[in-house]
Each structure stands twice: as C-alpha cells, then as structure tokens.
Interface confidence: low
C-alpha cells in the first residue's frame, strides 16, 4: 500500500503524512510530524498572509509612498495587504497601483464622459452634434448648444464641437 | 474493514523474551505510526511504544526502555513488539492501535483503531 | 511527564440522565496552533478501548453525537447527554501533546 498521494482542503503531503496548513494571519513555524501537529506562528506587525499556507515567512504589507502620489485607502491586517490609492486629481498607473498620474483633462471639443476616480483615469467622449466643450478639463462634459428659440431669438452663428451657436435678435423686416 | 489482528502473547519466565505482532488490514498501514498500550489486568492504561509511518522514529517509555523494541515491516503489514529481560510488572494485556492522522482535517485524530488485545503473563 | 487527573473514579448513573467526567492536567495540553491535545477513550467490558473524543472536542466517527468534550488548557469535560445502557465502561482521558503519551486513571461508569 502506498502512502497519500494527495491531502484533503487545507492540508498540505509532507513525508508522506498531510499536516495541517497554517490558517491567514500564520505562518509555518514546524511541519507536523507523526508525534505534533504543524506548528504555526502569527504574523509580525506590517506583515501578512492572505491563504491557508505553509510559508516560513509572512509577506510585507504593502508601503503608499506619498512621494509617488500614493495614500493608504485601506490599512493591511495580519491577513490583508494594505490597499493604497492616489491622492485627490490623481490615478493609478496599474491594478497594482505602484504610482500615480495627474488625470487627463478632456481637451476642447472632448467632454467627460466618466469622471476620473484613484483607480481609473478620466474618460474622454467627442462631442456630438448639437453638443460643444470650449475648455480643457477633468471634469467638465459636453454641454448642448444653447436653444435661440426658446429665447425669441434666431443662431446668427452656428455652433460647433468646441463653440456653442450665436444667437441674435430676430430680422423685423421680414415679418 | 480496517483492522488490526494481535498474536504473540503467552506465559513466559522473569529474564525471557517474547515477541508480539499486530497484523493491520484495510487501509495503507505504511502512512501511519503506530502504538502500544498496555493494561494490567483490572487496572488502568500505560502508554508503551510508538512508531513512525516509515520505522525511522521509534520512543519507549521509560518503564520499557532498553528492554522493549519497537520494529515494523510495511511489505507485510505489521507492527511488532520486541520484549526482552521480561520481568513479573510486565505482566499485562497488550494492545497496538493506530494514530489517526492521513485522511482527517487535523493531522492528529486520536488512536482510532486498536487491536483486540493479547495477554502477557511473566511468572516462575 | 504529564499526569492526567480524573474524578470521578466511579460514577453510578441512570439511563436516560446526563453523566459529566473531568480530567485535569498538570500542564496545558493547548499546542501554539490553538488546538488542545487531549483524547477521550471508552473501554466496554471486555472489550479494548475506543475513540470517543479527539483534540478535545472532536467527535470520532460513528460516536454518538450524545457524547460530547469540551474545555481548553488544563482543564476538559466529557459529557453524556443521556446515558444507555450500553456507555457502562471505564472512560480514560489521554493527552497526546507529548510523548510519552499519559492516562488518566480511568472513571469507571455503571448503572444504578
């Protein structure tokens, strides 16, 4: 007969015998044996390990390095790494948010379709017809042409993506 | 089925040896360590011997130590009990039992199996 | 060594009421992973022992789940809910945290 091939969940093969693994929050001091069960440890302050494990060592709890734009959004347990995020105006350059970037600002004729979070940068969209953008901003959309006609007037210039339309009293003479 | 068969025991003189066998069938006897218990008759438990899964770790209590050998052989599955210098206090119902561990979430599960039991009497 | 200390010794119970054992350690039998290395063990008459408890609260296989261990440290309780007929026996702790492995004296369980 052969001994186990394979463990049960949370289980590790070592020797031929499966040993507990150590829960989140531990790390592996000891394997079991025939005569003692695994022995764990908790991890240290700043560290942490976020599975059932049998690692040595616990793993550092991540730095937000202010001089990279960075801030904690979440501080780190014994079984969680810190999250960081950006600061105000700023985003993430990966999902593992390492550093930070200015947000983008939608130039004239571009609006924000989605404003820009510590994650995510700005969105930007093309103003449609009927809709223009005249500055360059993270936050601003596209804004509608303004409606002469509800104003008793008539466009004496037409809008484009980056101007909005003229409008102008009416002509009498052609009453 | 699981189980564990004893053979072995029987009346011997102070000064003499024996030797006791324990015979597991039904799961895979070379994963597992292995244990004597002893009792004397009308009295309670004493802890004798253990072994590892592969024979490499072997303890004695103190009572049986250099005089009692724990051994096993997983080609033919069985545990076995070497008694020597064998003395009137060793007199005693023997007993193996296996360390429950490979299959259960806890790498330790008590001694979930023993053997039925074989008698050693020491006496002139 | 470890000595395992158990009280009653003798313990005259009726079918159908509750039955407590205590075993007290002269050390704490909780290991550093938060487990506590003490067995529970029946022994019928006749009979050779059996697993009742493990690591002090665990329920072997195929025990009823009537019996039941509880405690931590160096103090621990075996507990019958209902006693039958067939729990008469002498009941023993075991403390597994070192070898050599130690009993307690055994509390012998019989009907009134």
């Known amino acids: 007969p052969e001994p186990p091939t394979a463990c049960r969940e949370k289980q590790y093969l070592i020797n031929s015998q499966c040993c507990s693994l150590c829960q989140p929050g531990q790390k592996l001091v000891s394997d079991c044996t025939e005569f003692t069960e695994t022995e764990c440890l908790p991890c240290g302050e700043s560290e942490f390990l976020d599975t059932w494990n049998r690692e040595t060592h616990c793993h550092q709890h991540k730095y937000c390095d202010p001089n990279l734009g960075l801030r904690v959004q979440q501080k780190g347990t014994s079984e969680t790494d810190t999250i960081c995020t950006c600061e105000e105006g700023w985003h993430c350059t990966s999902e593992a948010c390492e550093s930070c970037v200015l947000h983008r600002s939608c130039s004239p004729g571009f609006g924000v379709k989605q404003i820009a979070t510590g994650v995510s940068d700005t969105i930007c969209e093309p103003c449609p017809v009927g809709f223009f953008s005249n500055v360059s901003s993270a936050f601003e959309k596209c804004h509608p042409w303004t409606s002469c006609e509800t104003k008793d007037l008539v466009v004496q210039q037409a809008g484009t993506n980056k101007t909005d339309v003229v409008c102008g009293p009416q002509d009498r003479l052609r009453a | 089925e699981v189980q564990l068969v004893q053979s072995g025991g029987g009346v011997v003189q102070p000064g003499r040896s024996l030797r006791l066998s324990c015979a597991a069938s039904g799961f895979s006897f070379s994963s597992y360590a292995m244990h004597w218990v002893r009792q004397v008759p009308g009295k309670g438990l004493e802890w004798v011997s253990v072994?590892?899964?592969?024979?490499?770790?072997?303890y004695h209590a103190e009572s049986v130590k250099g005089r009692f050998t724990i051994s096993r052989d997983n080609s033919k599955n069985i545990l076995y009990l070497q008694m020597n210098s064998l003395r009137p206090e060793d007199t005693a119902v023997y007993y193996c039992?296996?360390?429950?561990?490979?299959?259960?979430?806890?790498?330790?599960?008590?001694?979930?199996?023993w053997g039925q039991g074989t008698t050693v009497t020491v006496s002139s | 060594d470890i000595q395992l200390t158990q009280s009653p010794l003798s313990l005259p119970v009726t079918p159908g009421e509750p039955a407590s054992i205590s075993c007290r350690s002269s050390?704490?039998?909780?290991?550093?992973?938060?487990?506590?290395?003490l067995d529970w063990y029946l022994q019928k008459p006749g009979q050779s022992p059996q697993l009742l408890i493990y690591?002090?609260?665990n329920r072997a296989s195929g025990v009823p789940d009537r019996f039941s261990g509880s405690g931590s440290g160096t103090d621990f309780t075996l507990k019958i809910s209902r006693v039958e007929a067939e729990d008469v026996g002498v009941y023993f702790c075991m403390q597994a945290l070192q070898t050599p492995r130690t009993f307690g004296q055994g509390t012998k369980v019989e009907i009134k």
């Open positions: 039992a296996r360390r429950g561990t490979v299959t259960n979430y806890y790498s330790y599960s008590g001694l979930d199996v």
């Open positions: 690591l002090a609260s």
């Open positions: 072994i590892s899964y592969d024979g490499d770790n072997k």
């Open positions: 050390q704490s039998l909780l290991y550093s992973n938060g487990k506590n290395y």
